[in-house]
Interface confidence: low
């Protein structure tokens, strides 16, 4: 499956967890292995134009959920989401466009 | 032109309720952490909570948390401070306060914008 | 929660003069440290926020700057209307707090 498409999936399920079901243990088990693939680095180049397009703000989005671990400070993970949503609506724009 | 305005405040009986309004213009309070903040007469700043309409995330200072609740209502662009059980030590100026919560993040948890204050009097 | 320990609580200063205002953190508060000015029966006005940052519209002679948990204020040339209370305040914890408060007085 294409990155676009399971960061699509993915945010979509982890926002209903986070902000459905304030489920913050299932959100993280949704979008770790998204930035787990993330990390391991583009293979392809539609991979690597993901990465270029979306890459820094997912990180940072990452950054702040990560602190968050630490610091249990809940604006922690609201300024994550802050970042997902954003990503969210550029892949979503960039989804219709091109379908 | 950003603004924010509070109501609701008055004198209150020891036990009583009181609701706060504070009503935002020139933003959306959707996308902004909005804060209480209260000064007791000659005394410095307290903050008492928060939401983020967004999520709907609230906090509560130790002192007011189980008493009072912060609320939103986005259609009309107000949050609210539900003031229960009073007590005369909440006698203060209560404040409401901006905090951006957009993307991107800009004043990182400082307080941008604040209304003109609402005395709130708790006394027999 | 995190406490923010002001010092002064109060200082006199003439017109001119160079005013540093200290705020300790009871632990890591990152850079999220805001300064704001208070003038009696008016609302706190923002001067300061990521601990360093000046916020647009404040005259250049008001600085902050941080070093491991402490935070200063300071004031380059004190002017007339500088006379007021200053807090500090995090906001890297859950609960979000104030430094009690520091009254600047003309000497």
């Known amino acids: 499956i294409l990155w676009h498409e399971q960061w699509h999936e993915g945010l979509e399920e982890a926002s209903r967890l986070y902000f459905g079901d304030r489920n913050v243990k299932g959100m993280f088990e949704i979008l770790e292995p998204l930035h787990a693939m993330l990390e391991r680095g583009p293979q392809t180049l539609k991979e690597t134009s993901f990465s270029q397009a979306y890459g820094r703000e997912l990180t940072e989005a990452y950054e702040w959920s990560q602190r968050y671990k630490t610091s249990a400070v809940v604006m922690d993970l609201d300024r994550a989401w802050d970042i997902y949503y954003h990503v969210f609506q550029k892949i979503s724009r960039h989804h219709h466009h091109h379908h | 032109e950003v603004q924010l305005v509070e109501s609701g405040g008055g004198l209150v009986q020891p036990g009583g309720s009181l609701r706060l309004s504070c009503a935002a213009s020139?933003?959306?309070?959707?996308?902004?952490?909005i804060h209480w903040v209260r000064q007791a007469p000659g005394k410095g700043l307290e903050w008492v909570a928060y939401?983020?309409?967004?999520?709907?995330?609230?906090s509560y200072a130790d002192s007011v948390k189980g008493r009072f609740t912060i609320s939103a209502d986005t259609s009309k662009n107000t949050a609210y401070l539900q003031m229960n059980s009073l007590r005369a030590e909440d006698t203060a100026v209560y404040y409401c306060?901006?905090?951006?919560?957009?993307?991107?993040?800009?004043?990182?948890?400082?307080?941008?914008?604040w209304g003109q204050g609402t005395l709130v009097t708790v006394s027999s | 929660d995190i406490q923010m320990t002001q010092s002064p609580s109060s200082l006199s200063a003439s017109v001119g003069d160079r005013v540093t205002i200290t705020c300790r953190a009871s632990?890591?508060?990152?850079?999220?440290v805001a300064w704001y000015q208070q003038k009696p029966g008016k609302a706190p006005k923002l001067l300061i926020y990521?601990?360093?940052s000046l916020y647009s519209g404040v005259p250049s002679r008001f600085s902050g700057s941080r070093s491991g948990t402490d935070f200063t204020l300071t004031i380059s040339s004190l002017q007339p209307e500088d006379f007021a209370t200053y807090y500090c305040?995090?906001?890297?914890?859950?609960?979000?707090?104030f430094g009690q408060g520091t009254k600047v007085e003309i000497k």
């Open positions: 632990q890591s508060v990152s850079s999220a």
């Open positions: 939401i983020y309409p967004y999520s709907g995330y609230t």
């Open positions: 305040q995090q906001s890297y914890g859950s609960l979000i707090t």
């Open positions: 306060a901006r905090n951006y919560g957009g993307y991107p993040r800009k004043y990182a948890g400082a307080f941008d914008y």
């Open positions: 020139g933003f959306n309070v959707s996308s902004s952490y």
């Open positions: 990521s601990a360093s």
